[in-house]
C-alpha cells in the first residue's frame, strides 16, 4: 500500500480468482483514543471499533472511503484504490489502446517545434468518475524539471457503438535549448483512477521523435505565362523552431485530382517553392517534415488549382 | 529519406554539400544495423544514449546560431562561442569563432573515425560475419574532414590484445551509429546555417 | 472453490458452427479475464482467444480471427466461444482458464471437426 | 507457429536432476513473465511456476524455475515416476499481449 496523496492510498492486488488480498491496517487520524468506530463509504454499518482497524482487501467491495468517528463526528478519512496486477502486468482498462505506431501504445506526443513544449492525449471510453493527474520529466534517476498543465477533455466521438473521449496536456521543458542533442529522454507519467481503480501509464520519448510540424502556412498559386503550369509557394509554419536556416524543413508537394483514384504527382524539395502543372479540378497540397531528423510529416495544407 | 530532392547548387560551401552526404551515410548505416542486429538491443529505446565527445568537443555549443545566444538554456554555463559568419570556403575569411565550431566538428569526426574503424577490426575478426561498417560512411567521414582542411595530430588506431566480445561490440556499434546520427544532424544543421549566412 | 465446467463439444462437418460454454463459480466471474486454449491430439498447447473482464477488449489468434468469437454474460458466470466455417485443423481438446497469475482451467472439451 | 522454443524430450532416472530450457526473445521472455505447467495425459494443465521462479501452495519444492536474459528454465530436483508428463512454459509478447504465448512442450520420461 502507498499513498498516492493526502488521505489516499493504493493497494496493490495481486489480482486472479480466490487470491488472498493484501491486509491493510488504517489509522485514525484523531488524538483520541477511546469510542472510535470505522464505517465504509454511506453505510453506517460498524465495520470494526478502535484507533486502528484491520482489513483484508481482495475486491473493489473492499476498496473505497473509509471513516473513523466518535459520537456521530467524523475524525478523517482514507480512501482506498485498487491496483490490479494480472499475471505480472499492471492492468490497462481505463485507456484505450491507440496502436499506434506500435501495439500498447496508450499515451501519444507531439511537439510542433524544439522548444521544450509538447501534447500528450489519450483516449478512454469512460465518461464519468475520472479523474487523470500527469507528471514528466526529463530523465528519471536525476530527474530535470518538465511541468505539465491540468490534463482536459478535448474531444469527443462516436465510435460505432461506443462513444470515445480524448483527454490531453500540455508540458514544458523548464530549460530547454532548442539546438540541444538530448541524451535522456522525457519522461510522462499518467495517474488515472476510475471510482475505486487506480493505474498509472508511463511515455518515454525525446522531443526530436515526436517533431510534426504545423503544415506549411501562406500556400498560393502564380501561373505561368502560356503555360498550364503554376508556381507553388509557401512559408514556414510561425511555430517552427528559429532561425530557420538552422532548423531547415524539407516539403513535399502533391497533386492531387478530384477522385481519389487519380494518380497523384508528388515533388520533393528543400526550397518554399515548387513548379508544378495544375490540372482541372485538381488541389495543390504541401506539408513539410524536418530537413535534417525524419520524424512525422506535418498534415497538409491545400489550395484548389482553379 | 529515399524521397527525390533537387541536387545542391554547384556554387554551394562545399562542407554543406559533404555533410549531406554523411547525414545520408550513417542513417544507412543505422539502417542497416538495426536490421542485421534485429536479436539485439539497437533501437533508439534500447541502447543507452551515450556521446563519446562529452566533455572532449564542444560542438552543440561551439556552433550555436547567434539567435539562439540568447537563450539562457543553451549557454549551459560554459565559455560558449557563437557562429557570427562566414564559410568553410578557403577564399573566404573565417572568424575566430567560426574556426572554434569548424574544428570542434573536425575534432568530433576523427575521434568517431577512430572509434569505427577499431570496432570494425574488431567485427573483422567475428565468425559470424555478421555486419562490418559501410565504407561509404568511412570514406564520407575522410572527405568531410578533408573539405574541413584542419590539421591535428592524427590519434592512433586503438588495439587490444584481448579476445573481442562480439556481442558487446556490436551493442557498442549500435550506441556509435545512434550517437554519431544525432552529431551527424548537427552538423547539418550548422553547415546549413553557415550557408546561409 | 474456483470451479470452471465446459460444454459444448462434439463431432462436426467442415464448414459448420458449434459454440462452446465455460460455466464459472466459487468467484466474482466480472472482475476476471479469461483464455480460451487448445491442444490438437499429440500436439502442444495453443492459445484462442482472451475477453477482458467486462467484456470491452478480444483478442483473437490468427488462426481463428474471423471465424470464432469469445463472449461472456457476467449475468450468467459463462463464458462462450462461437465457432464457425469449422476446419479439420480445428480439431482439438478446448479449455477455458482464467487470466491472472494463478489460474483455473476448465475440464476440457473435445471438438472434431471431419465430414 | 511458436516462438518459445523447448527440447522435445528430457530424461533421467529416480533422484536426478533434471532440466528443461525455454528459449525466447526480447520482447517476450526478455521483458515478460514466465509460466511453466505439468500436463499428464489426459487432463488439464497445472500450474507448477509463475512469476519466473514462484511456486503455488501446493507444489513439491523439488520444482523451480530461473529466468535470465531471453531463456528461462525449469528445473526438477531429484525427480520422481510420477513427474513423467508433458511440461510448457508461457509466456507473453508485450506487443501482444494479452495474448499467451505457449513453448512447444517438453516429454519428461522417468527412466527404470
Known amino acids: 500500500i502507498w499513498e498516492l496523496k493526502k488521505d489516499v492510498y493504493v493497494v496493490e492486488l495481486d489480482w486472479y480468482p480466490d487470491a488472498p488480498g493484501e491486509m491493510v491496517v488504517l489509522t485514525c487520524d484523531t488524538p483520541e483514543e477511546d469510542g472510535i468506530t470505522w464505517t465504509l463509504d454511506q453505510s453506517s454499518e460498524v465495520l470494526g471499533s478502535g484507533k486502528t482497524l484491520t482489513i483484508q482487501v481482495k475486491e473493489f467491495g473492499d476498496a473505497g472511503q473509509y471513516t473513523c468517528h466518535k459520537g456521530g463526528e467524523v475524525l478523517s478519512h482514507s480512501l482506498l484504490l485498487l491496483h490490479k496486477k494480472e499475471d505480472g502486468i499492471w492492468s490497462t482498462d481505463i485507456l484505450k489502446d491507440q496502436k499506434e505506431p506500435k501495439n500498447k501504445t496508450f499515451l501519444r506526443c507531439e511537439a510542433k517545434n524544439y522548444s521544450g513544449r509538447f501534447t500528450c492525449w489519450w483516449l478512454t471510453t469512460i465518461s464519468t468518475d475520472l479523474t487523470f493527474s500527469v507528471k514528466s520529466s526529463r530523465g528519471s534517476s536525476d530527474p530535470q524539471g518538465v511541468t505539465c498543465g491540468a490534463a482536459t477533455l478535448s474531444a469527443e466521438r462516436v465510435r460505432g457503438d461506443n462513444k470515445e473521449y480524448e483527454y490531453s496536456v500540455e508540458c514544458q521543458e523548464d530549460s530547454a535549448c532548442p539546438a540541444a542533442e538530448e541524451s535522456l529522454p522525457i519522461e510522462v507519467m499518467v495517474d488515472a483512477v476510475h471510482k475505486l481503480k487506480y493505474e498509472n501509464y508511463t511515455s518515454s520519448f525525446f522531443i526530436r521523435d515526436i517533431i510534426k510540424p504545423d503544415p506549411p502556412k501562406n500556400l498560393q498559386l502564380k501561373p505561368l505565362k502560356n503555360s498550364r503550369q503554376v508556381e507553388v509557394s509557401w512559408e514556414y509554419p510561425d511555430t517552427w523552431s528559429t532561425p530557420h536556416s538552422y532548423f531547415s524543413l524539407t516539403f513535399c508537394v502533391q497533386v492531387q485530382g478530384k477522385s481519389k483514384r487519380e494518380k497523384k504527382d508528388r515533388v520533393f524539395t528543400d526550397k518554399t517553392s515548387a513548379t508544378v502543372i495544375c490540372r482541372k479540378n485538381a488541389s495543390i497540397s504541401v506539408r513539410a517534415q524536418d530537413r535534417y531528423y525524419s520524424s512525422s510529416w506535418s498534415e497538409w495544407a491545400s489550395v484548389p488549382c482553379s | 529519406r529515399n524521397l527525390p530532392v533537387a541536387t545542391p547548387d554547384p556554387g554551394m560551401f562545399p562542407c554543406l554539400h559533404h555533410s549531406q552526404n554523411l547525414l545520408r551515410a550513417v542513417s544507412n548505416m543505422l539502417q542497416k544495423a538495426r536490421q542485421t542486429l534485429e536479436f539485439y538491443p539497437c533501437t533508439s529505446e534500447e541502447i543507452d544514449h551515450e556521446d563519446i565527445t562529452k566533455d572532449k568537443t564542444s560542438t552543440v555549443e561551439a556552433c550555436l546560431p547567434l539567435e539562439l545566444t540568447k537563450n539562457e538554456s543553451c549557454l549551459n554555463s560554459r565559455e560558449t562561442s557563437f557562429i557570427t559568419n562566414g564559410s568553410c570556403l578557403a577564399s573566404r575569411k573565417t572568424s575566430f569563432m567560426m574556426a572554434l565550431c569548424l574544428s570542434s566538428i573536425y575534432e568530433d569526426l576523427k575521434m568517431y573515425q577512430v572509434e569505427f574503424k577499431t570496432m570494425n577490426a574488431k567485427l573483422l575478426m567475428d565468425p559470424k560475419r555478421q555486419i562490418f561498417l559501410d565504407q561509404n560512411m568511412l570514406a564520407v567521414i575522410d572527405e568531410l574532414m578533408q573539405a574541413l582542411n584542419f590539421n591535428s595530430e592524427t590519434v592512433p588506431q586503438k588495439s587490444s590484445l584481448e579476445e573481442p566480445d562480439f556481442y558487446k561490440t556490436k551493442i557498442k556499434l549500435c550506441i556509435l551509429l545512434h550517437a554519431f546520427r544525432i552529431r551527424a544532424v548537427t552538423i547539418d544543421r550548422v553547415m546549413s546555417y553557415l550557408n546561409a549566412s | 472453490q474456483v470451479q470452471l465446467v465446459q460444454s459444448g463439444g462434439g463431432v462436426v462437418q467442415p464448414g459448420r458452427s458449434l459454440r462452446l460454454s465455460c460455466a464459472a463459480s466459487?468467484?466474482?466471474?466480472?472482475?476476471?479475464?479469461m483464455h480460451w486454449v487448445r491442444q490438437a491430439p499429440g500436439k502442444g498447447l495453443e492459445w484462442v482467444a482472451f475477453?477482458?473482464?467486462?467484456?470491452?477488449?478480444?483478442y483473437y489468434a490468427d488462426s481463428v480471427k474471423g471465424r470464432f468469437t469469445i463472449s461472456r454474460d457476467n449475468s450468467k458466470n459463462t463464458l462462450y466461444l462461437q465457432m464457425k466455417s469449422l476446419r479439420a485443423e480445428d480439431t482439438a481438446v478446448y479449455y477455458c482458464?482464467?487470466?491472472?497469475?494463478?489460474?483455473?482451467w476448465g475440464q476440457g472439451t473435445m471438438v472434431t471437426v471431419s465430414s | 507457429s511458436y516462438v518459445l522454443t523447448q527440447p522435445p524430450s528430457v530424461s533421467g532416472t529416480p533422484g536426478q536432476r533434471v532440466t528443461i530450457s525455454c528459449s525466447g526473445g526480447?520482447?517476450?521472455?526478455?521483458?515478460?513473465?514466465v509460466k511453466w505447467y505439468q500436463q499428464l495425459p489426459g487432463t488439464a494443465p497445472k500450474l507448477l511456476i509463475y512469476?519466473?521462479?514462484q511456486r503455488p501452495s501446493g507444489v513439491p519444492d523439488r520444482f523451480s524455475g530461473s529466468k535470465s536474459g531471453t531463456s528461462a528454465s525449469l528445473a526438477i530436483t531429484g525427480v520422481q515416476a510420477e513427474d513423467e508428463a508433458d511440461y510448457y512454459c508461457?509466456?507473453?509478447?508485450?506487443?501482444?499481449?494479452?495474448?499467451?504465448?505457449f513453448g512447444t512442450g517438453t516429454k519428461v520420461t522417468v527412466l527404470g
Open positions: 508461457q509466456s507473453y509478447d508485450r506487443g501482444t499481449h494479452p495474448a499467451l504465448l
Open positions: 475477453i477482458r473482464y467486462d467484456g470491452s477488449n478480444k
Open positions: 482458464k482464467t487470466h491472472g497469475s494463478h489460474d483455473n
Open positions: 466459487g468467484f466474482t466471474f466480472s472482475s476476471y479475464g
Open positions: 512469476g519466473n521462479d
Open positions: 526480447r520482447s517476450n521472455i526478455g521483458s515478460m513473465t
